[in-house]
C-alpha cells in the first residue's frame, strides 16, 4: 500500500505564439481545480477507461478575475497535493491523466458551471520511494508544469511496496536472514509471509499465506504469465504450455466492489460500477457532496448537500457512468464512409480518411469523374476510388489523348498484313482467308464459311473494320 | 438543430416481439448515419443496431439474428424490430445520428424508450 502524490507549480499559457485566452473575465470569475486519473502499465488506454489505479480531485483554487488589457498569466492554483492511495502494490509502470477543470462563479442557474480547459496524458516508469520527479506537459496553448512521486505506506517498503517493515526487535541488529528496512534503517524487513513458493518477483501479499499477482501475471504462486490470446474463454484451459489463465476464482468472486458496487470482469481485471455517492477502484471512497465537483465532462450535480447524502450527476448527451467519466462509443455507429476510420475527440467525430477520399465524412471521391473530360470522344468510368477514361476507337492513354496504333496489337489473322486507317484498321488478308480480321477461311471452290460475303468484296479483297 | 423521437416501448415476456421507431425531424438535415443504442441500469450505453455512414446495417452481436433495423427514407424514420427478446434487453432504447447541417456534422440523441422484458 501507499500514496501516489501530485504537486501541481503551475498552470498558464505555454511558450510561443498564439497565446490563450484567460478563462476567466470580470463578467465570468473562475477559479481551477485538478483531477488525476492513475492507471497500471503503459497501456495507450482511452480517457475514458476506468482509474484502476485510483483518482483524486484537488481542492478549488483562489478566485481569479481576469485584469483587462493584461496576458493570461499563471493561474492561481489550489493549495496542497493530489493524492492518490493505493492499495496493492505499485505497478513500477503507469499511465496518469491529469485535467484542468474551470470553474465558473456568475450567476449560473442551477449553481457553478464546470468545463475542461485541458487535458494532458503520459506513460512514466517510476518506482515507489524515489525522489519528486518533474515534469512538463502540452495541451495546445496551454502549459501544465507538475512533480510526482510514489510512496510507501508503513509497513510497506521497496520499489513496489511489497516489502513489510516492522520495528526492531533488538537494538542492534535484525533476526537471522531478514535485512535491515532502508532507508528505515532503524527497521526492520518483517519475516517472509505471503504462501510458500510465492513467485518474489511476480508476488506479493499483504496477509499472512497469500500470494497476491502483480498485472500480467496468475496462478497460485503468480508464476504463470496470462497469455489469453489462445485460451478458449477468459479463463481458459489450464495449461503450463499455453500459459493461459488458470481455472479458478475469477476477479469477480467475492465481490471485490465495496458499498453495494457491483462487479463486472473486464480482460485485465475487475470493474466496480458505484452507487451514487461512492467511487474508487473498489467503490471504497465515499462521503463526496456537490461541493466536491464529482460530476465531470460538464454534468450536472444535483443533491448531495452534505456527505450523508447521494449526489446523482446529469450527463450531457454523449457521457455516461455514475460521474460522467465515460465516452459514449459514438464510432461504433461507424458514421465514415468509405473505410475512413473514426475518431471520437468528444467535442466532435472526426474521420481520417483513406487515400483517394476526402470531406469531414470521407463522403468526397477525390477522383471520380467530376470534372474530368475523357478526350477524343472517350467516356468516364468510376470505381473503387479511382477513374479511367474507356477511349474511343484510335486512342489511348489515361485520358485519351494519346493516339493508338490499332495495328500494335497484331489484330489481323492467318498472316493478315495490318494498315493503319483514319476510322480504325484495315487487314489485308493471305491468300485464303478472309473477313474483317481474316479469321475465316475460303473454301477450295470459292465459298467461304460466311453465309454469304458482303456485297461488293470478293474473298481477297482487303477488309476494312469500322 | 434536429429533433429524434423514439416510440414503441413497453413491457414484453421473454420471446415476445417489440418494435421501435425512432423520428428524425427538423428543417435542412440529411442523415449520414442513424442506428439505436440501449442502456441498462448501471451499464454502458452500447451501439445495437444502425445504418453506417455507408448505409451498411450493422448490428451487435448479442443480437444478431434477432433484432432488424429498417428505414423509411420518405419519412426521415428507423425501425428496430425486435423479437425473441430475453430479460438481458430490458434497457432504455436510443436513437442516435449523424446528421449534415449545412456543411457541419453534429450528433443527436434521443430520449429514449424503455424496453422491459420480464416473465
Known amino acids: 500500500a501507499g500514496v501516489f502524490e501530485l504537486q501541481i507549480h503551475s498552470f498558464g499559457p505555454g511558450p510561443g505564439p498564439g497565446a490563450p485566452r484567460s478563462p476567466c473575465s470580470a463578467r465570468l470569475p473562475c477559479r481551477l481545480f485538478f483531477r488525476v486519473c492513475l492507471k497500471p502499465g503503459l497501456s495507450e488506454e482511452a480517457a475514458e477507461s476506468p482509474c484502476a489505479l485510483g483518482a483524486a480531485l484537488s481542492a478549488r483554487g483562489p478566485v481569479y478575475t481576469e485584469q483587462p488589457g493584461a496576458p493570461a498569466p499563471d493561474l492561481p492554483l489550489p493549495d496542497g497535493l493530489l493524492q492518490v492511495p493505493f492499495r496493492d502494490a505499485w505497478p513500477g509502470t503507469f499511465s496518469f491523466i491529469i485535467e484542468t477543470w474551470r470553474e465558473e462563479l456568475g450567476d449560473q442557474i442551477g449553481g457553478p458551471a464546470w468545463s475542461l480547459l485541458a487535458r494532458v496524458a503520459g506513460r512514466r516508469r517510476l518506482a515507489a520511494g524515489g525522489p519528486w520527479a518533474r515534469d512538463i506537459q502540452r495541451a495546445g496553448a496551454w502549459e501544465l508544469r507538475f512533480s510526482y512521486r510514489a510512496r510507501c505506506e508503513p509497513p510497506a517498503v521497496g520499489t513496489a511496496c511489497t516489502r513489510l517493515c516492522r520495528p526492531r526487535s533488538a537494538p542492534s541488529r535484525c533476526g537471522p536472514g531478514l535485512r535491515p528496512c532502508a532507508p528505515l534503517e532503524d527497521e526492520c524487513e518483517a519475516p517472509l509471509v505471503c504462501r510458500a513458493g510465492c513467485s518474489p518477483e511476480h508476488g506479493f501479499c499483504e496477509q499472512p499465506g497469500e500470494c497476491r499477482c502483480l498485472e500480467g501475471w496468475t496462478g497460485p504462486l503468480c508464476t504463470v504469465p496470462v497469455s489469453t490470446s489462445s485460451c478458449l474463454s477468459p479463463r481458459g484451459p489450464s495449461s503450463a504450455t499455453t500459459g493461459c489463465l488458470v481455472p479458478g476464482p475469477g476477479p469477480c468472486d467475492g465481490n471485490p466492489c465495496a458499498n453495494g458496487g457491483s462487479c463486472s470482469e473486464t480482460p485485465r481485471s475487475f470493474e466496480c460500477t458505484c452507487p451514487r455517492g461512492f467511487y474508487g477502484l473498489r467503490c471504497e471512497v465515499s462521503g463526496v457532496t456537490c461541493a466536491d465537483g464529482p460530476c465531470f465532462n460538464g454534468g450536472l450535480c444535483v443533491g448531495g448537500a452534505d456527505p450523508d447524502s447521494a449526489y446523482i450527476c446529469h450527463c450531457p448527451p454523449g457521457f455516461q457512468g455514475s460521474n460522467c467519466e465515460k465516452r459514449v462509443d459514438r464510432c461504433s455507429l461507424q458514421p465514415c464512409r468509405n473505410g475512413g476510420l473514426c475518431l471520437d475527440l468528444g467535442h466532435a467525430l472526426r474521420c481520417r480518411c483513406r487515400a483517394g477520399f476526402a470531406g469531414p465524412r470521407c463522403e468526397h471521391d477525390l477522383d471520380d469523374c467530376a470534372g474530368r473530360a475523357c478526350a477524343n470522344g472517350g467516356t468516364c468510368v468510376e470505381g473503387g476510388g479511382a477513374h479511367r477514361c474507356s477511349c474511343a476507337l484510335g486512342f489511348g492513354g489515361r485520358d485519351c489523348r494519346e493516339r493508338a496504333d490499332p495495328c500494335a496489337a497484331r489484330p489481323c489473322a492467318h498472316g493478315g498484313r495490318c494498315y493503319a486507317h483514319f476510322s480504325g484498321l484495315v487487314c489485308a488478308c493471305a491468300p485464303g482467308y478472309m473477313g474483317a480480321r481474316c479469321e475465316f477461311p475460303v473454301h477450295p471452290d470459292g465459298a467461304s464459311a460466311l453465309p454469304a460475303a458482303p456485297p461488293g468484296l470478293r474473298p481477297g479483297d482487303p477488309q476494312r473494320y469500322l | 438543430e434536429v429533433q429524434l423521437v423514439e416510440s414503441g416501448g413497453g413491457e414484453v415476456q421473454p420471446g415476445g416481439s417489440l418494435r421501435l421507431s425512432c423520428a428524425a425531424s427538423?428543417?435542412?438535415?440529411?442523415?449520414?448515419?442513424i442506428g439505436w443504442y440501449r442502456q441498462a441500469p448501471g451499464k454502458q450505453r452500447d451501439m445495437v443496431a444502425g445504418?453506417?455512414?455507408?448505409?451498411?446495417?450493422t448490428y451487435a452481436e448479442s443480437v444478431k439474428g434477432r433484432f432488424t433495423i429498417s428505414r423509411d427514407n420518405a419519412k426521415n424514420t428507423v425501425y428496430l424490430q425486435m423479437s425473441s427478446l430475453r430479460a438481458e434487453d430490458t434497457a432504455v432504447y436510443y436513437c442516435?445520428?449523424?446528421?449534415?447541417?449545412?456543411?457541419?456534422?453534429?450528433?443527436?440523441w434521443g430520449q429514449g424508450t424503455l424496453v422491459t422484458v420480464k416473465p
Open positions: 442516435a445520428a449523424d446528421v449534415k447541417i449545412g456543411g457541419d456534422y453534429e450528433w443527436f
Open positions: 427538423g428543417s435542412d438535415f440529411s442523415i449520414n448515419a
Open positions: 445504418f453506417t455512414g455507408d448505409t451498411v446495417t
